[in-house]
């Protein structure tokens, strides 16, 4: 049984490592697989001190634990390297940290990236 | 640290029906998708269903199909698996399994045994 | 029906290396399919040794180690010890919410 599944066609692209791994540095990719697979977007940051630094976002294969998200959220408690997946085209261009295992507010607010 | 507790197995006869449970701790249980594997005696590991972080989206092996039904509890943190027309092939251990990033298990429960005879 | 084949059973001396493979019916193996791996002995749990191809769960040897070998996933034990003797499980997610798992290796540590 599925609920109200979006499909992802694309997700915004970002590599902070785009020199080294010879790739573009920021766009939009198209996300490809098999037909019988599911696509999704994802992004990965770190918080230095404070400031926010992405890593990468993109296209991630199909992978149950970003079924049903339409908003990429990290809810993990303090990770070391922040990780977020969705569907819905482009759905990482905007991507947030909210930890459920305080009961307080939100520590910080939903980061829109300016790569 | 991470517990599944699986609980509800038993013995039941052939058409019956049985509903187990694993009880989830350690961990935000409403962030991860969850499974159920099971293993007949002697046999090998064979997955039977899994469950997606809300729940709209569940998933069976073909042969349990119509018969049994995942669901989970978020507010409970506890995953069930309803089993219903029961038959001897269904005898076996049932793990949960709490799946990660990258669609794999990486923390399983003791299991429950599940007995169906007449 | 996708069939995830292994190698039934496999022996090794203490301290030589083995390879398990883990294939599928319908084509080749890549780390699209996320190959994990798992070790079982008799009326344990199943125990997490490898995922996402090639990552070594926490607290694995890394004695242990995933691959991709040809058309196939592949778990190698190098410097095998008697208390790896056990049942290994590989395990492929196909997509959509469904995993197929092997029939699992049978693991002889020799002496």
């Known amino acids: 049984a599925i609920l109200g599944r979006s499909e992802t066609q694309e997700c915004l692209f970002f590599n902070a490592n785009w020199e080294k791994d010879r790739t573009n540095q920021t766009g939009v990719e198209p996300c490809y697989g098999d037909k019988d697979k599911r696509r999704h977007c994802f992004a990965t940051w770190k918080n230095i001190s404070g400031s926010i630094e992405i890593v990468k976002q993109g296209c991630w294969l199909d992978d149950i634990n970003c079924y049903d998200r339409t908003d990429c959220v990290e809810k993990k408690d303090s990770p070391e390297v922040y990780f977020c997946c969705c569907e819905g085209n482009m759905c990482n261009e905007k991507f947030s940290y909210f930890p459920e295992m305080e009961v307080t507010q939100p520590t910080s607010n939903p980061v829109t990236p300016k790569p | 640290e991470v517990q599944l507790l699986e609980s509800g197995g038993g013995l039941v006869q052939p058409g019956g029906s049985l509903r187990l449970s694993c009880a989830a701790s350690?961990?935000?249980?409403?962030?991860?998708?969850m499974s159920w594997v099971r293993q007949a005696p002697g046999k090998g590991l064979e997955w039977v269903s899994g469950?997606?972080?809300?729940?709209?989206?569940?998933y069976y092996t073909d042969s349990v199909k119509g018969r049994f039904t995942v669901s989970r509890d978020n507010s409970r943190n506890t995953l069930y698996l309803q089993m219903n027309s029961l038959r001897a092939e269904d005898t076996a251990v049932y793990y949960c399994?709490?799946?990660?990033?990258?669609?794999?298990?990486?923390?399983w429960g003791q299991g429950t045994l599940v007995t169906v005879s007449s | 029906q996708t069939v995830v084949t292994q190698e039934p059973s496999f022996s090794v001396s203490p301290g030589g290396t083995v390879t398990l493979t883990c294939g599928f019916n319908?084509?080749?193996?890549?780390?699209?399919?996320?190959p994990s791996w798992y070790q079982q002995t008799p009326g344990q749990a199943p125990r997490t040794l490898i995922y996402?191809?090639?990552t070594r769960s926490s607290g694995v040897p890394d004695r242990f180690s995933g691959s991709i070998l040809g058309n196939k996933a592949a778990l190698t034990i190098t410097g095998a010890q008697a208390d790896d003797e056990s049942d290994y499980y590989c395990?492929?997610?196909?997509?959509?919410?469904?995993?197929?798992f092997g029939g699992g290796t049978k693991l002889t540590v020799l002496g």
């Open positions: 399994a709490k799946v990660y990033y990258s669609s794999f298990f990486d923390y």
């Open positions: 350690g961990f935000t249980f409403r962030n991860y998708a």
């Open positions: 469950i997606s972080v809300t729940g709209g989206s569940t």
């Open positions: 319908s084509g080749s193996v890549s780390t699209s399919y996320y």
């Open positions: 996402n191809t090639n």
């Open positions: 395990v492929l997610y196909m997509g959509s919410g469904i995993w197929v």
